[in-house]
Each structure stands twice: as C-alpha cells, then as structure tokens.
C-alpha cells in the first residue's frame, strides 16, 4: 500500500535539487575568490537540514541559521540593488554594472534562485510532487522562509544610497505584499541608510507619464520617510537604452533622459 502523501497546491521540489545546489555552490565559489574557502558539502548539508524531516508549513528562520552562517558574505553595503517584480532587468543591470549587487548575486541568493524545495515531516525524503503554496497553503514554507531570511539580512546590510528597481507596468508599482514591500523596506537601517532611490521601469514605448507620482510610489515614500530615510525616484522610460548606456556611458545619446 503506498504511503499517504500530503498534496500541496504548489509545484514540487525542482528536479535534481541537491545536484543543482551543489553545482551552483561550486560554480559560485570558483568565480568569487573571496568565497573559495566555502565548503559546498557543508553548505548543502545545512540547506538540507533546514527543511528535511520537518513539516513544510512549520519552517522558521532559525532552521536556516547554519546555512546563513556558511553563506556569510561581505558585499559593499553602498552598492546594493533591490528589485520588485522585475528580476530579469535587475540581473541584466548587475551583470553589466559589476560593482553593484542584487541578492541573487550573493552566494545564498544564487544557490536558490528560481528553485523550489520542501520535505516531509518525519521522513528524510525530498518532496518532488508538490510543495506548499504561500497563499493557498501556508506562509511558513521552506522557500518563503528562506527568501524572507536572506532578504532581511541583505536589507540590514545596506548603507548610504540603496537603489530599488520597480516594475512600472504593474498595477501596483510598489506592492506592500512583495518581499521588497514586506521585508526589505522595513529592514533598511536608518542609522546606515541615507537614501532609498527608486528606479521605476517603464514598459510601453510611448509611455511618457511620470510614474514617480503613482499613488503606490507615494505610499512607499511615506513609509520610507517615516523611517527617517530620504526617498528619491527616477523614471526609466527606455530600459533597453538604460542598459545600453550603462554598458557605454560615453555614447552621445546617453546624455538625454532615459
């Protein structure tokens, strides 16, 4: 008789999850000299230990502490780029602007980017069939708790001017329920962070509106100001040109507004 298995609403663990995490760890440590002493076997053991044999709706930040310790990494605190609902462009930007970092440019973010994982209570098995959905099942699931933990730490580390890339094509340009809105905004440290600068990325070719006047941006400004952090906002009307100008700042067309 097959053992009864909990059916969750979300997709199951990404196939070849252990192999993917280990391979990514080795690749990352190879590329980043300051992380070459990292023991990827220990990293995987700590990652696994955070969720294996535990109920996937009962995961805590504490479960991830060994992994957080192993992934401790110093990034320049004044070179942090946060993003919300516009990951691809943020990553394209830091691939060009090599001295700036998104969370996924750190070891822990790189390991988990685009992956799903969960286990089962009291068994050492990884659940490849289904994992809890944040909305439909539970918020304290392995993936959500991981991203909440690393996002909090990343925001806490930031200093000086922090940039955030926001998607101007969405109905809520700033969404209080996003990881940025619910975690990162509230964990920026006012004693270290002087300014949060939002870059609102326009989607349409002919979109010339000032999206910095959007009500949700005003809401973000209000939250940030109440936390004693200055706020500034820029429209990025042409994201393609924006990236091109980051690559080639000397280009004559890069003096005009992008």
């Amino acid at each position: 008789v097959p053992r009864w298995r909990q059916q969750w609403s979300g997709p199951g663990t990404t196939k070849r999850f252990p192999e993917t995490v280990l391979a990514r760890c080795v690749k990352y440590t190879e590329i980043h000299p300051e992380m070459r002493h990292v023991d990827c076997q220990s990293v995987w053991d700590a990652f696994k230990g955070a969720f294996i044999s535990k109920h996937p709706c009962n995961i805590t930040e504490e479960d991830y502490q060994p992994l957080m310790k192993l992934g401790t990494q110093t990034v320049p605190c004044n070179k942090i780029l946060l993003w919300s609902r516009i990951k691809d462009l943020a990553h394209q930007f830091t691939q060009v602007q090599r001295d700036m970092f998104t969370l996924e440019d750190t070891l822990l973010g790189y390991l988990a980017d685009d992956l799903t994982w969960c286990g089962e209570f009291n068994t050492s098995k990884i659940n490849y069939q289904s994992c809890p959905d944040w909305r439909k099942d539970c918020s304290n699931n392995p993936v959500s708790v991981f991203w909440k933990t690393v996002s909090r730490r990343f925001a806490e580390a930031a200093c000086d001017v922090v940039h955030v890339m926001l998607n101007g094509s969405r109905s809520k340009i700033f969404d209080k329920n996003s990881t940025f809105g619910s975690v990162e905004v509230h964990n920026l440290q006012p004693e270290k962070v002087q300014t949060l600068e939002a870059w609102v990325i326009h989607g349409g070719r002919e979109d010339s509106r000032d999206l910095c006047q959007d009500p949700t941006i005003k809401e973000l400004e209000s939250i940030i100001s109440k936390r004693n952090i200055q706020f500034s906002c820029k429209n990025i009307y042409r994201p393609d040109k924006f990236l091109q100008c980051v690559k080639n700042p000397e280009d004559s067309s890069c003096t005009s507004e992008i």
């Epitope: 002493h37 023991d39 990827c40 220990s42 700590a46």
Partner: antibody, heavy 121, light 107 residues
Framework: QVTLKESGPALVKPTQTLTLTCTLS??????????VGWIRQPPGKGLEWLAH???????RYNPALKSRLTISKDTSSNQVFLKIASVDKEDTATYYC?????????????WGQGTLVTVSS | EIVLTQSPATLSLSPGERVSVTCKAS??????VAWYQQKPGQAPRTLIY???YRYSGVPARFSGSGSGTDFTLTISSLEPEDFAVYYC?????????FGQGTKVEIK
C-alpha cells in the same frame, strides 16, 4: 597520482629570507579550481596554516604573518613558492605544502612529506 | 581567530578499544571541520572532512560527528596502526586554524 614535494634550505640564518618550493605532479596549478597551501609545524608542536594560492593567482595569507609572507607560483614548472622574510628561531619548523580544491573547503586532501628548516646563526 | 581546543591531550589505550577525541571551537563553525592523523616523521593524512565525511580510502572504523562548536573523532576499535597524533582543523573562516593535537598511545 597526485604528489607534492617540498624543498628548501635545511639551515637559514636569522634575518635572512627563506624560500621554499613545492613541486606538484599528478595535477596542474593551471587547472581551474586547484589551489596549493603551506602549513608548518615547529618541532614537537602543532600545525599552523600560513598561506595558499589558487590557479588564477588569488592569494590568501595568515594575518599574523602576512607582512613577512609571499606566496607565488610558476605554472610552467608546476611549482609553488613561499618566501618568509626576516626569519628568526621561531620559524624553525617542518614546512608542508598541501592541495585544496574550490568548493570543498580549505582542508588539505593531499600533503607533501615536508621539509625541515632550522633557523640558527 | 578561531581557537580549537582538543581533549584529552593524551590517551593511553589498548588495541580493540573505542576512542573518542573531542575538538571544541571558540565560535560556531557549523560543519567546516577536518580531522588528520599524523605518525612520527610523517605528514598529516586526511581522515574526515565536513565534520562527518570519511575521506576516500579511510577505514570505516573512523567516523566524525558534531556541528557548531563541538566535534568528535571516533575510532570504533583501535588497530595497532592507529596509534598516532590526531588534529582537527577549522576552515570556516580565515585564518584557518588547527587544534593542538591529541596523542593516542599504546597503554
């Protein structure tokens, strides 16, 4: 098979610079992911990590000795060198080189047999 | 720097006995610990890495355990060739450090 062999002067005078050589075989330091480190052991005492160097010339030093240490490599001869400046009696030790690998942590899977260096006038 | 304290300094035992050597780190190193065996006049030899993984070719009687600050090397049944000095090493952070060693001698 993988082997490492240390060589250097058996005797050096205080204040001189000691140069040690680690000759590698069975693997190449031009191969991605490989590194070689130096560890020493004073007579009757424990082990001390000194420095290591990676295939791409990234170097790491023990902060307590950093000002006196220089690690380098010659890929063509498959050798790694360690220079210790201004030696004194406390530098008398058996010096080992060992291999490390990216992604495995900095533990030493392979060791040379060691070379004993005495600092004396 | 992280200080590793091994205990005991010396163990006097007979072949066939079980051995436990402990290594205590001055701060949490998760599982980034290796164990080495060193015989007189020889270089150290790797036994255990990542706290609990036996290195290739190492007999099954050797095992490692622990995480955080407390680690143990166990030899389930001492063989005559196991009489040696055992060192732990942390590679969690620079500078990498070793314990002072534990000598396992014949009683």
């Amino acid at each position: 098979q993988v082997t490492l062999k240390e060589s250097g002067p058996a005797l050096v005078k205080p204040t001189q610079t000691l140069t040690l050589t680690c000759t590698l075989s069975g693997f190449s330091l031009s191969t991605s992911r490989m590194g070689v480190g130096w560890i020493r052991q004073p007579p009757g005492k424990g082990l001390e990590w000194l420095a290591h160097i990676w295939w791409d010339d990234d170097k790491r030093y023990n902060p307590a000795l950093k000002s006196r240490l220089t690690i380098s490599k010659d890929t063509s001869s498959n050798q790694v060198f360690l220079k210790i400046a201004s030696v004194d009696k406390e530098d008398t030790a058996t010096y080992y080189c060992g291999r490390i690998e990216v992604g495995r942590g900095a533990w030493f899977a392979y060791w040379g047999q060691g070379t004993l260096v005495t600092v004396s006038s | 720097e992280i200080v590793l304290t091994q205990s005991p300094a010396t163990l006097s035992l007979s072949p066939g006995e079980r051995v436990s050597v402990t290594c205590k780190a001055s701060q949490d190193v998760v599982t980034t610990v290796a164990w080495y065996q060193q015989k007189p006049g020889q270089a150290p030899r790797t036994l255990i890495y990542s706290a609990s993984y036996r290195y290739s070719g190492v007999p099954a009687r050797f095992s490692g355990s622990g995480s955080g600050t407390d680690f143990t090397l166990t030899i389930s049944s001492l063989e005559p060739e196991d009489f040696a000095v055992y060192y732990c090493q942390q590679y969690y952070t620079y500078p990498f450090t070793f314990g002072q060693g534990t000598k396992v001698e014949i009683k």
